[in-house]
């Protein structure tokens, strides 16, 4: 469930603190409820960037698990189509710390509406 997703995000945050990853990531910091699945997709795609750049087994495994969890939760809700949402590349670029904070916020949005 989404609580496990948050715990994975916390784990990624802890793992990243011991590294020096300068990447900036497309971040949706003001998610509209009607675009939350699209925003989630962008967050997950950017997480893969973190995983790739870190080259770290623990981060890789945690990112992969988080994506598996999110996939299964969202697929159980059926196909949700959203329109009029921003493309990932249109989002503001932020550092990893801000990115992860925004990610937690969107997950909490899913928790609150489930």
């Amino acid at each position: 469930n989404w609580v496990n997703v948050i715990s994975d995000l916390k784990k990624i945050e802890d793992l990243i603190q011991s590294m020096h990853i300068d990447a900036t990531l497309y971040t949706e910091s003001d998610v509209h409820p009607s675009c939350k699945v699209t925003a989630m997709k962008c967050f997950l795609l950017e997480l893969q960037v973190i995983s790739h750049e870190s080259g770290d087994t623990d981060i890789h495994d945690t990112v992969e698990n988080l994506i598996i969890l999110a996939n299964n939760i969202l697929s159980s809700n059926g196909n949700i189509t959203e329109s009029g949402c921003k493309e990932c590349e249109e989002l503001e670029e932020k550092n990893i710390k801000e990115f992860l904070q925004s990610f937690v916020h969107i997950v909490q949005m899913f928790i609150n509406t489930s």
Epitope: L44, L45, Q48, S51, T57, T62, V63, N65, A70, N79
Partner: antibody, heavy 122, light 112 residues
């Protein structure tokens, strides 16, 4: 050439336990997730378990969840499948397979071991 | 759970002729990141399975180019442009977009 050697199969009574092993060589074991897949006699393939590269994350279908445990020892290049509370329907050839994970270009079980036969019967 | 349904279950083919196997999923297997994790495996008689195709249409290294994969969403196809004697065996589609990962029932290819 990637090598995977499954072992530990045999005859076991219903309710019994068995531990399968899969020895890996000719590749960096810790860089890959691993899976177990089984095939009942004359039947199709069934996914049984997957474990992440570091071993922290495991995945199972409901048919084996709570009875089977996948684990790994990266220092020994070995994958395990602990099977408890075995049933007649667990009778199958068990294959271990190396799993390419998404960050490295998509999911797939790209190399398979030769399989070890588990027979559950009284 | 995602159910994978293959057809036909038995496929008699003349050597040198094309063959086509269909695989249909009970729901879309496009994941949240837009990827479709659909593979095809070949199992020759008495052998372990072998990867042919991954992510719908990517041929694994060493796989002859007479094998090709296509499809999207819920409908997928494995094609063999000219069947050879060594192609005899059972072919399985497999999805690992969603847990639990699931195989199709298998299609047995035999020579007429």
């Amino acid at each position: 050439e990637v090598r995977l050697m499954a072992s530990g199969g045999g005859l076991v009574q219903p309710g019994g336990s068995l531990r399968l092993s899969c020895a890996a060589s000719e590749f960096t074991f810790s860089n890959y997730a691993m899976s177990w897949v089984r095939q009942a006699p004359g039947k199709g393939l069934e996914w049984v378990a997957t474990i992440s590269r570091g071993g922290d994350y495991t995945y199972y279908p409901d048919t084996v969840k709570g009875r089977f445990t996948i684990s790994r020892d990266n220092s020994k290049n070995t994958l395990y499948l602990q099977m408890n509370s075995l049933r007649a329907e667990d009778t199958a050839v068990y294959y271990c397979a190396r799993r390419v994970s998404m960050i490295t270009g998509g999911y797939a079980m790209d190399y398979w071991g030769q399989g070890t036969l588990v027979t559950v019967s009284s | 759970d995602v159910v994978m349904t293959q057809s036909p279950l038995s496929l008699p083919v003349t050597l040198g002729q094309p063959a086509s196997i269909s695989c249909r999923s009970s729901q879309s297997i496009v994941d949240i990141t837009g990827n479709t994790y659909l593979e095809w495996y070949q199992q020759r008689p008495g052998q372990s399975p072998r990867l042919l195709i991954y992510k719908v249409f990517n041929r694994f290294s060493g796989v002859p180019d007479r094998f090709s994969g296509s499809g999207s969403g819920t409908d997928f196809t494995l094609k063999i442009s000219r069947v050879e004697a060594e192609d005899v065996g059972v072919y399985y589609c497999f999805q690992d977009s969603f847990v639990p990962y699931t195989f199709g029932q298998g299609t047995k290819l035999e020579i007429k």
